[in-house]
Interface confidence: low
């Protein structure tokens, strides 16, 4: 015998519900109809749905799914977005401080060099900023350019101040002599090594965060397939066709549907886990010469030492350069005059006292800890979405896609699905092209992160020892050493805890500026999730 008509024999409830989805009632039957044209909500008897309603339900179901996915990723998305912005700004602040300290060192110790030195220092740190943000600049070239530019000024201002104006066309010769005679000793090489290591790591760290944003944005804006739309419609809306307005889908059924719909997205899981673990490894290695905060904020000291090195060898150098660059001068001219204060005592720059011990490195570790709580994000998505959409508790008295059942049975539900579309097939289709692309990008960044994961055998420290620098003086639990030669290493107590300015740009520049750029991103975020402590580096 035919099944009884739906409890709502006039389709009144269905009409009023559908009115909210689609103003106008022309698609809703007044009373139950055979529904022979339906393709998704296949009726077992009279139905309150039409083909047009079914299409609208499918569209709504897919939109619902997209919104659920977006809300699922909202917290993670803002965690990475906020931190990417904060770190980018923080790195710029480190660069600005490093520039200010270097300028201050020149101002305090070598005032006669300042006009030109400020300019060269500004250019150097601009390049540093651009490099961090992905610009194709060679770090060795940056360092060479800094020392090539500084040496003629040091020579003409400090070493041979009696040089007549007519001899000032020797700049090119002096730039060449700087490298040939190694006038700054091994300091340029030391700076190259430290700066390139620390900036490389910083750059890849920012790249990784920006890729994290891209991954979330990609999965956030996935368009679900028609098959998925049909499955979702059956789960969420087909019960309405039978007038069952209050019934909820079975939890187990929801999980099956979500796993089908999210099969492609879940494929990201393996690479996402690897991404977070590789990022953690990178962050764990970001200390000493792999920490740009440590390296850049110590540059003023190393540059100061390098100029002292030149001054100590000034007599010998002046003679050699006088011969080497004689052809550039109208007559060979050397002054025996040296300013009395040539061998200036080192003045350790006063570092502004900041009470809290917060650093970028602790902020990085905090981010990793938070990211690790999202390590199963993609594999847990189907379950998360089911738990955040209406499902029946305990799988009792619930909708299984075809009918109201006392208890959900996965086997029965699957058998019922087979005659409409194959769930297994849906899983086998493989990820969307955009998902495949993002997986490729994750593979690439994971490879980069792995190759960049630092201190395996402290190779670099060994190299520095060979160059004659006493890196042995710096134990891990001592104050960090910042650059320096064997006879006068500057130590800055506790490094510089300047995070007070992290992302809160309170400029103290009094030297010529260096313009810095931010990496453009197309995405606009218009909903700001309250991140609580994520925004506050001081808790």
């Amino acid at each position: 015998q035919p099944p009884p008509p739906p409890p709502d024999a006039t389709c009144h409830q269905v009409r009023s519900f559908f009115q909210r989805l689609q103003p106008g009632l022309k698609w809703v039957p007044e009373t139950p109809v055979p529904g022979s044209d339906l393709q998704v909500c296949l009726p077992k008897g009279p139905t309150c749905c039409s083909r047009k309603m079914e299409e609208k339900y499918q569209l709504t179901a897919r939109l619902n799914m997209e919104q659920l996915l977006q809300s699922a990723s909202m917290e993670l998305k803002f965690l990475i977005i906020q931190n990417a912005a904060v770190f980018q700004e923080a790195f710029e602040i480190v660069v600005r401080h490093a520039k200010n300290y270097t300028n201050a060192m020149f101002k305090n110790n070598y005032p006669s060099l300042t006009p030109q030195a400020f300019e060269f220092v500004g250019e150097f740190f601009t390049d540093v900023s651009l490099y961090i943000l992905g610009s194709d600049i060679n770090v060795d070239d940056m360092v060479n350019e800094l020392f090539d530019s500084l040496f003629p000024v040091i020579y003409t201002q400090l070493m041979n101040p009696g040089l007549p104006d007519s001899a000032l066309d020797i700049n090119e010769c002096l730039r060449g002599a700087r490298r040939d005679l190694k006038v700054f000793g091994n300091f340029p090489k030391l700076i190259m090594t430290q700066v390139s290591k620390s900036l490389q790591v910083t750059r890849i760290f920012l790249q990784a965060l920006n890729l994290g944003i891209e991954v979330i944005n990609t999965t956030d804006h996935l368009k679900f397939s028609k098959d998925c739309g049909r499955m979702l419609t059956r789960m969420w809306y087909c019960s309405y066709c039978q007038g069952l307005m209050m019934v909820k889908p079975c939890g187990g059924y929801c999980n099956v549907v979500m796993q089908g719909c999210m099969a492609g997205v879940v494929e990201i899981d393996k690479y996402w886990r690897e991404y977070i673990l590789s990022l953690e490894e990178l962050v764990n290695g970001m200390y000493r010469i792999y920490d740009m905060e440590n390296v850049l904020l110590g540059l003023f000291s190393t540059i100061h030492d390098s100029i002292q090195y030149v001054q100590k060898n000034a007599g010998k150098l002046t003679t050699t350069i006088g011969k080497l660059c004689a052809h550039s001068q109208q007559r060979q001219y050397r002054s025996a005059y040296y300013p009395e204060d040539l061998f200036i005592d080192k003045k350790v720059l006063k570092v502004a006292h900041v009470e809290h011990e917060e650093t970028l490195s602790s902020r990085r570790r905090e981010l990793i800890q938070k990211l690790k709580s999202f390590i199963s994000f993609y594999s847990a998505l189907p379950g998360y979405i089911c738990s955040h959409s209406p499902v029946a508790e305990n799988d009792t008295l619930c909708w299984n896609g075809q009918e109201l059942v006392e208890r959900y049975s996965q086997k029965a539900a699957r058998n019922g699905m087979k005659n409409q579309f194959n769930l297994h097939e849906l899983k086998m289709k493989g990820p969307e092209p955009v998902v495949s692309q993002i997986i490729d990008k994750l593979k690439h960044i994971n490879q980069l992160l792995r190759t960049m994961s630092m201190p395996k055998g402290r190779v670099l420290d060994k190299n520095l020892d060979e160059e004659g620098f006493e890196s042995g003086d710096c134990g891990d639990d001592e104050d960090e050493c910042i650059g320096g030669s064997g006879d006068g290493m500057i130590k800055v107590k506790n490094q510089l805890r300047f995070l007070a300015e992290l992302a809160y740009d309170l400029d103290v520049d009094d030297a010529p500026g260096n313009s810095q750029q931010a990496t453009p991103k197309d995405n606009e975020i218009s909903t700001f999730h309250n991140l609580g402590n994520v925004h506050s580096p001081l808790k």
């Epitope: 912005a85 809160y504 400029d507 500026g513 750029q517 931010a518 990496t519 991103k521 925004h535 506050s536």
Partner: antibody
Framework: QVQLQQPGAELVKPGASVKMSCKAS????????MHWVKQTPGQGLEWIGA????????SYNQKFKGKATLTADKSSSTAYMQLSSLTSEDSAVYYC?????????WGQGTLVTVSA | DIVMTQSHKFMSTSVGDRVSITCKAS??????VAWYQQKPGQSPKLLIY???TRHTGVPDRFTGSGSGTDFTLTISNVQSEDLADYFC?????????FGSGTKLEIK
């Protein structure tokens, strides 16, 4: 030096929209957040939201969602805030301010008067 | 949202005196608090942040202290030009919020 220039006043009719500007100079516009703050005698200072011009990311105070829209034009180093469906409640001084937390630099403010 | 409460709407003081303006946060904001001064017809000016660091150019008679939920701005040796509104602000979490302000009046 850092400067944020805002027009002095805007008179608008109820129900209309207004788009106010904040022209930045003296620093790299794309490197810093630009925040917007509303001040009324009754409500005091209220944070509306912020935009990071470098990548266009915006964040809003829930209270001003749908009311305010923040944009930035990198080429002219100008940040904009559009207020829609204006009512007398929107009459206030609106400031742009630069920074990530404390605001070290503020514009002079734009007085918006909503009146028929 | 975090509510910043400045319990005194007005405070009266004399030139040369010392005055303390207080601000209470509805939840722990660490040390992410700033103080601003605003004179009639002008935009606010940053005085103190984190919450004891003086901004460039701010006279050293202005000092800030506190952490967690209780914060204080102290002006020692008050000058007539200090007559203004003073606001606290938290930047620990979005949305950033301000206190309602304390108007400093000179007797």
């Amino acid at each position: 030096q850092v400067q944020l220039q805002q027009p002095g006043a805007e008179l608008v009719k109820p129900g209309a929209s207004v788009k106010m500007s904040c022209k930045a100079s003296g620093y790299t516009f794309t490197s810093y957040n630009m925040h917007w703050v509303k001040q009324t005698p009754g409500q005091g200072l209220e944070w509306i939201g912020a935009i990071y011009p470098g990548n266009g990311y915006t964040s809003y105070n829930q209270k001003f969602k749908g009311k305010a829209t923040l944009t930035a034009d990198k080429s002219s180093s100008t940040a904009y805030m559009q207020l829609s469906s204006l009512t007398s409640e929107d009459s206030a001084v609106y400031y742009c301010a630069r920074g990530g937390g404390p605001f070290a630099y503020w514009g002079q403010g734009t007085l918006v008067t909503v009146s028929a | 949202d975090i509510v910043m409460t400045q319990s005194h709407k007005f405070m009266s003081t004399s030139v040369g005196d010392r005055v303390s303006i207080t601000c209470k946060a509805s939840q722990d904001v660490g040390t992410a608090v700033a103080w601003y001064q605003q004179k009639p017809g002008q935009s606010p000016k940053l005085l103190i942040y984190w919450p004891s660091t003086r901004h460039t150019g701010v006279p050293d008679r202005f000092t800030g202290s506190g952490s967690g939920t209780d914060f204080t701005l102290t002006i020692s040796n008050v000058q007539s030009e200090d007559l203004a509104d003073y606001f606290c602000q938290q930047y620990s979490s979005y949305p950033f919020t301000f206190g309602s302000g304390t108007k400093l009046e000179i007797k």
